[in-house]
Interface confidence: low
């Protein structure tokens, strides 16, 4: 089998509250029932795993309790939200999708979404 195609937006700007959302869409070659989604951050040639979740088709994604990610799934689309971002977290966020069950196993790797995070300007001092 060929590697599975994964599409994600090229660029996303995080909100002033440090929240960024993007869609990760995969071209499923078969009818998977168990899917694993992983978000990786690449910056300065270093790659770290931001979060990961396994879900059964039709169910919610469940990330670890202390994860900065949340998400929902709809068909072959996963809507991912990353919270608590600061300017230093700017980087390329890669979506990796694995069809875990039933066999055969498929792996798809997106080209990455460049997330830009701008720290909000501090409010000027005010007497009011």
């Amino acid at each position: 089998c060929k590697a599975m195609h994964v599409a994600q937006p090229a660029v996303v700007l995080a909100s002033s509250r440090g929240i960024a959302s993007f869609v990760c869409e995969y071209a499923s070659p078969g009818k998977a029932t168990e899917v694993r989604v992983t978000v990786l951050r690449q910056a300065d040639s270093q790659v770290t795993e931001v979060c990961a979740a396994t879900y059964m088709m039709g169910n919610e994604l469940t990330f670890l309790d202390d994860s900065i990610c949340t998400g929902t799934s709809s068909g072959n689309q996963v809507n991912l939200t990353i919270q608590g971002l600061r300017a230093m977290d700017t980087g390329l966020y890669i979506c990796k999708v694995e069809l875990m069950y039933p066999p055969p196993y498929y792996l798809g790797i997106g080209n990455g979404t460049q997330i830009y995070v701008i720290d909000p300007e501090p409010c000027p001092d005010s007497d009011f």
Partner: antibody, heavy 124, light 106 residues
Framework: EVKLVESGGGLVQPGGSLRLSCATS????????MSWVRQPPGKALEWLGF??????????EYSASVKGRFTISRDNSQSILYLQMNTLRAEDSATYYC???????????????WGQGTSVTVSS | QIVLTQSPALMSASPGEKVTMTCSAS?????MYWYQQKPRSSPKPWIY???NLASGVPVRFSGSGSGTSYSLTISSMEAEDAATYYC?????????FGSGTKLEIK
Amino acid sequence: EVKLVESGGGLVQPGGSLRLSCATSGFTFTDYYMSWVRQPPGKALEWLGFIRNKANGFTAEYSASVKGRFTISRDNSQSILYLQMNTLRAEDSATYYCARDSLAYPHYYAMDYWGQGTSVTVSS
Amino acid sequence: QIVLTQSPALMSASPGEKVTMTCSASSSVSYMYWYQQKPRSSPKPWIYLTSNLASGVPVRFSGSGSGTSYSLTISSMEAEDAATYYCQQWSSNSFTFGSGTKLEIK
């Protein structure tokens, strides 16, 4: 510089136990899956299992050949990986390697750094 | 569990000769990885994701394949290429290695 150094190998009697250690340095240990691989003398490599990273709850997976007898654990404060081997058999005699499982493109699911190995002999 | 069968088990090549070794999977896999191992040394990652060369690997090496059939090719054999090469795959929470191809220099 990434370094993996195994220790704890030696001679053990059949039915005995042994704990191997893999001291690591040069990378953020909690970010990586870590595997154990063995190689009997003159034979092929055999993957034994891995332990996942922090993002995946540090859970472990094992090959069918050692499941129930071997346990992989990690001390994240000291960046040490362990392999606890119980009920050892003659066929467990091998060089045991620890390896780091890479997450970086294009190395997904490859073992990008290996230790030098530690030898285990199971014999009476 | 997916079984990887490498062939040939042993081969020899003259300097400058083209070398191809194969790795056959018992069922379809998405990617293949290759490692080089020399006597009394640890394995070294050699090819990632079927066709990406690891850092420092000479460009005379290449990898290709899909589904159940993969191969590693050396365009022009050199003495330093003499080693054992292992293929490896990942599928659904388990790694497996092939039986190895030992490549000798004539």
